[in-house]
């Protein structure tokens, strides 16, 4: 008799999930000498242990603690780049400026980036059919709890000047309900972080508005200031030119032609 299976509103676990996580772990530890000591089989076992046989709407940060411990990594605390709804450009930037790090440049972020996973209560099976949607089903699902956990830890580790890339094409440039707005902002440590510098990325070539004056940016400034952290904001009008400039700071295109 076929067992009844819970149908969730979100897509199921990414195909070949265990193989993907293990392969990513091996690749990451080969590229990053400081993480060569990591045993990838143990990492996978800890990852699996966080959600297998558990109800996918009843996952806690505690479930991920063994994985967090194994994936402990020190990144330069003054070289952290947060982002909200502009992941690709943030990653392009850290690929060029190799001394800065997004969450996905760390082992745990790299393992889970763009993947979905969940299990089922009381069975050791991975659910490849469907997983809970954050809005339609439940917020305490394996993927959401994972990102909340690693994002909190990443923000807590930050110091000095923290940068955040924001999407100036969105109706809410700063969104209180994003991971940045709901988790990272509130976990920056005022005793360590001097300034949060927002980089607002413009979408249109002819867009010369000062989006640092946007009401949602003013809201972000207010939240940050109340936490005794200074706030700074920059408009990046031409992200393509900006990246080119980061690659070649000597290039005349970084300034006006004389």
């Amino acid at each position: 008799v076929p067992r009844w299976r819970q149908q969730w509103s979100g897509p199921g676990t990414t195909k070949r999930f265990p193989e993907t996580v293990l392969a990513r772990c091996v690749k990451y530890t080969e590229i990053h000498p400081e993480m060569r000591h990591v045993d990838c089989q143990s990492v996978w076992d800890a990852f699996k242990g966080a959600f297998i046989s558990k109800h996918p709407c009843n996952i806690t940060e505690e479930d991920y603690q063994p994985l967090m411990k194994l994936g402990t990594q020190t990144v330069p605390c003054n070289k952290i780049l947060l982002w909200s709804r502009i992941k690709d450009l943030a990653h392009q930037f850290t690929q060029v400026q190799r001394d800065m790090f997004t969450l996905e440049d760390t082992l745990l972020g790299y393992l889970a980036d763009d993947l979905t996973w969940c299990g089922e209560f009381n069975t050791s099976k991975i659910n490849y059919q469907s997983c809970p949607d954050w809005r339609k089903d439940c917020s305490n699902n394996p993927v959401s709890v994972f990102w909340k956990t690693v994002s909190r830890r990443f923000a807590e580790a930050a110091c000095d000047v923290v940068h955040v890339m924001l999407n100036g094409s969105r109706s809410k440039i700063f969104d209180k309900n994003s991971t940045f707005g709901s988790v990272e902002v509130h976990n920056l440590q005022p005793e360590k972080v001097q300034t949060l510098e927002a980089w607002v990325i413009h979408g249109g070539r002819e867009d010369s508005r000062d989006l640092c004056q946007d009401p949602t940016i003013k809201e972000l400034e207010s939240i940050i200031s109340k936490r005794n952290i200074q706030f700074s904001c920059k408009n990046i009008y031409r992200p393509d030119k900006f990246l080119q400039c980061v690659k070649n700071p000597e290039d005349s295109s970084c300034t006006s032609e004389i």
Partner: nanobody, 117 residues
Amino acid sequence: QVKLQESGGGLVQPGGSLRLSCVASGSISSIITMGWYRQAPGKQREFVARVIIGGSTGYADSVKGRFTISRDNTKNTVYLEMNSLKPEDTAVYYCNAGNPGTSYHYWGQGTQVTVSS
């Protein structure tokens, strides 16, 4: 508009050091690069060094290893630490700020650096 105010120039002996400062004020949200150019008498203005938000830096070959550019976010200031100065470094040093691919580009009034014994 953005106003750039340089300071720190002066007369120094060969082998000596100077530190130039440039403070930006006004619509600073439009500035993502800050740097230094110089113009010696009878010559064209030339690039010296630049810093981009996030900390990426670039230098002219003639100053690499001797000059260091840095920025202080909180003070909207860029610095140029100049060591092992040579007579050929004598010039008016101009602060420059801008935003690549836009018309947002600004110049300071310049500060004189003279290297002579």
